[in-house]
């Protein structure tokens, strides 16, 4: 601060800053005028004794004589463009003349007006019957500022001993409502913006699987309260689970677009069809009223049951080598729809009953031909099975004679009917 300044006799100031008092945002101008002999000095403005480095001030110099060394009138104007609390204080002009510092008489800038909102209630969407808070804060000067909350334009009785609540705790709503707050001080009343609190349905709960099939899941849930607004529909989202599922489960949105199904309610139940068998999914549900959708439930992991393989084993061959028959095949190319548990083999002759064998997970088996009774037109079929049951059987494959150097067959060769010179096989 400038303590060595002078305002006594000899001061060049002939006009001092006046006073301004007004509301926030005010545009005001302070002026000082001085008369000096010789070259006019630059006028500096002080607020509360401190130089205003970035002052928005103008300065005009008018010669009062013919010569620049004669008297000059200097007018400096300080602009306050949008009055705020930090602008309030004592203002003075200051000049340096011939090694001395002079300051004008002070002018005062004060902020006084209607209350000013530091915080106003904001629009919110809240689940029905769920507590929430709204905030409102205002200040003067003049102080004190008291707040009055209004719900749907009706004043709310202030909580005892809390005539100036910054925060309004509401136990919950069953209908969409508007809230505002009034700030009162000695200058009058300012009303905040009106916040709309939209009442949405509560999050559904107890989402669960009612029944499971290989390509279908039936799920049900319990809806949450929705206030005075009936539920119009629910949306179910299903997404294929994968190894990265844990990364996004905690977040609101899955990595890829989920399958979204809209269902009318009631009943609060839905059959998901055309799913992949033996496949993990994650599902969630949200229910909507005329006011909007509820929050989504958490993702629920679900899984379809296993199905049977969709096709028979491939490249089935049956080759006779002496008293043995080597039967080979490959895994079905079509989806297994579950975990492959093994293969079953069936063989029969023209006039003999069918024999069934569980081969396990191997893809070849040797059958021993015993006995002396011939079996006509012996054929072999193979099926793959999961826990859900057998898949389709392969077409019956007739025996082929072993051809030296033939190697492992990749597919059976159609050949003439096998000779009748072997008896019913046992193994």
């Amino acid at each position: 601060a400038h303590k060595d300044t002078q305002t006594e006799a000899g001061s060049p100031f002939v006009g001092n800053p006046g006073n301004i008092t007004g509301a926030r945002g005010l545009t005001g101008t302070l002026r000082c005028e001085l008369q000096v002999q010789g070259e006019p000095p630059e006028v500096v403005w002080l607020r509360d004794g401190q130089i205003l480095e970035l002052a928005d001030n103008t300065q005009t110099q008018v010669p009062l004589g013919e010569d620049w060394q004669d008297e000059w009138k200097v007018v400096s104007q300080l602009r306050i463009s949008a009055l705020q609390l930090s602008d309030a204080g004592e203002y003075q002009c200051m000049v340096h003349l011939e090694g001395r510092t002079f300051v004008s008489q002070p002018g005062f800038v004060g902020l006084e007006g209607l209350p000013y909102f530091l915080e106003e209630p904001e629009d919110k969407a809240v689940p029905a019957n769920t507590p929430f808070n709204l905030s409102c804060q205002a200040q003067g000067p003049p102080e004190p500022v008291t707040l009055l909350w209004l719900q749907d334009a009706v004043p709310l009785a202030p909580v005892t001993g809390h005539s100036s609540q910054h925060s309004l705790q509401t136990p919950g709503l069953n209908k969409t409502s508007s809230f505002s707050c009034e700030a009162h001080n000695a200058k009058g009343v300012t009303t905040s913006r009106t916040a709309t609190i939209t009442v949405l349905p509560q999050r559904p709960h107890h989402l669960h699987v009612v029944s499971r099939q290989p390509t279908e899941l039936e799920v049900a849930w319990t809806p949450g309260l929705s206030g005075i607004y009936p539920l119009t529909h629910c949306n179910l989202q299903a997404v294929l689970s994968d190894d990265g599922v844990g990364i996004w489960l905690g977040k609101s949105d899955p990595p890829e677009d989920p399958l979204t199904l809209q269902v009318s309610v009631p009943p609060h139940q839905l059959r998901l069809e055309k799913l992949l068998p033996h496949t993990p999914y994650h599902i969630r549900i949200s229910c909507s009223s005329s006011q909007g959708p509820s929050p989504w439930t958490h993702w629920l992991p679900v899984e379809t049951t296993e199905g049977v393989p969709l096709g028979p084993p491939e490249n089935v061959s049956a080759m006779r080598n002496g008293s043995q028959v080597l039967v080979r095949w490959q895994e079905p190319r079509v989806p297994l729809q579950g975990t492959l548990l093994g293969y079953r083999l069936a063989y029969r002759g023209q006039d003999t009953p069918e024999v069934l064998m569980d081969i396990g997970l191997t893809r070849e088996v040797t059958l021993e031909l015993r006995g002396d009774r011939p079996v006509a037109n012996l054929t072999v079929s193979v099926t793959a099975y999961t826990s859900a049951g057998d898949g389709p059987w392969s077409l019956p494959v007739p025996l082929e004679p072993w051809r030296p150097g033939q190697g492992q067959p990749l597919h059976h060769l159609v050949s003439e009917p096998p000779p009748r010179a072997f008896s019913w096989p046992w193994w």
Epitope: P17, T27, R31, D56, T58, A82, G107
Partner: antibody, heavy 125, light 107 residues
Framework: EVQLVESGGGLVQPGGSLRLSCAAS????????IHWVRQAPGKGLEWVGW????????YYADSVKGRFTISADTSKNTAYLQMNSLRAEDTAVYYC??????????????????WGQGTLVTVSS | DIQMTQSPSSLSASVGDRVTITCRAS??????VAWYQQKPGKAPKLLIY???FLYSGVPSRFSGSGSGTDFTLTISSLQPEDFATYYC?????????FGQGTKVEIK
């Protein structure tokens, strides 16, 4: 005698630029705030912005912020309005005006006591 | 921004009539209101500043009054040269804003 004279108006295409000048005489530009005000054909007055020529500080209306720049050269006693990215809605007569500063030690608000004759800016393709 | 609403938007009057134009601010602007006169093809001219102070050289038949939100410009005895458009302007806050204008025509 106090006088303000604008120049630089004319026809310009949308997206184009134009620079208007406001030459002051009879007073020192550094002692006042200078305002630019425009008037669309058959319409009312709209404030564009002001400058403090002594400090070079300028304020703008939201409608022109980022597109228009007000400057001043106190040695030439001239203020300027640089208009870029012009739009059809910028078509108007543009006036420069001096802020009135004839009151005592303080004042709230201001008036504009001297105005130029205006210069027409037409933005059209 | 503060809105300034002038009324009427136009009026017809005769020479010698007393004419009153009003201007209403959308919020308190103290006395930071000025009045201007504009004739076709010409720049506006300052008549009244600070709501009620007559600018130098303006005939005394013009007067202004008001404070807060309601302001009035009065021409006590309309003269032939007074037929023009009149604008009010607030400068309490930035941006300064003008009324839409009142056109005074010859009856």
């Amino acid at each position: 005698e106090v006088q303000l004279v604008e120049s630089g108006g004319g026809l310009v295409q949308p997206g184009g630029s134009l620079r208007l000048s406001c030459a002051a005489s009879g007073f020192s530009l550094s002692g006042s705030w200078i305002h630019w005000v425009r008037q669309a054909p058959g319409k009312g007055l709209e404030w564009v912005g002001w400058i403090n020529p002594y400090r070079g500080y300028a304020y703008y209306a939201d409608s022109v912020k980022g597109r228009f720049t007000i400057s001043a050269d106190t040695s030439k006693n001239t203020a300027y309005l640089q208009m870029n990215s012009l739009r059809a809605e910028d078509t108007a007569v543009y006036y420069c005006a001096r802020e009135y500063s004839g009151w005592g030690g303080s004042s709230v608000g201001y008036a504009m006591d001297y105005w130029g004759q205006g210069t027409l800016v037409t933005v059209s393709s | 921004d503060i809105q300034m609403t002038q009324s009427p938007s136009s009026l017809s009057a005769s020479v010698g009539d007393r004419v009153t134009i009003t201007c209403r601010a959308s919020q308190d602007v103290s006395t930071a209101v000025a009045w201007y006169q504009q004739k076709p093809g010409k720049a506006p001219k300052l008549l009244i500043y600070s709501a009620s102070f007559l600018y130098s050289g303006v005939p005394s038949r013009f007067s202004g009054s008001g404070s807060g939100t309601d302001f009035t410009l009065t021409i006590s005895s309309l003269q032939p040269e007074d037929f023009a458009t009149y604008y009010c302007q607030q400068s309490y806050t930035t941006p300064p804003t003008f009324g839409q204008g009142t056109k005074v025509e010859i009856k």
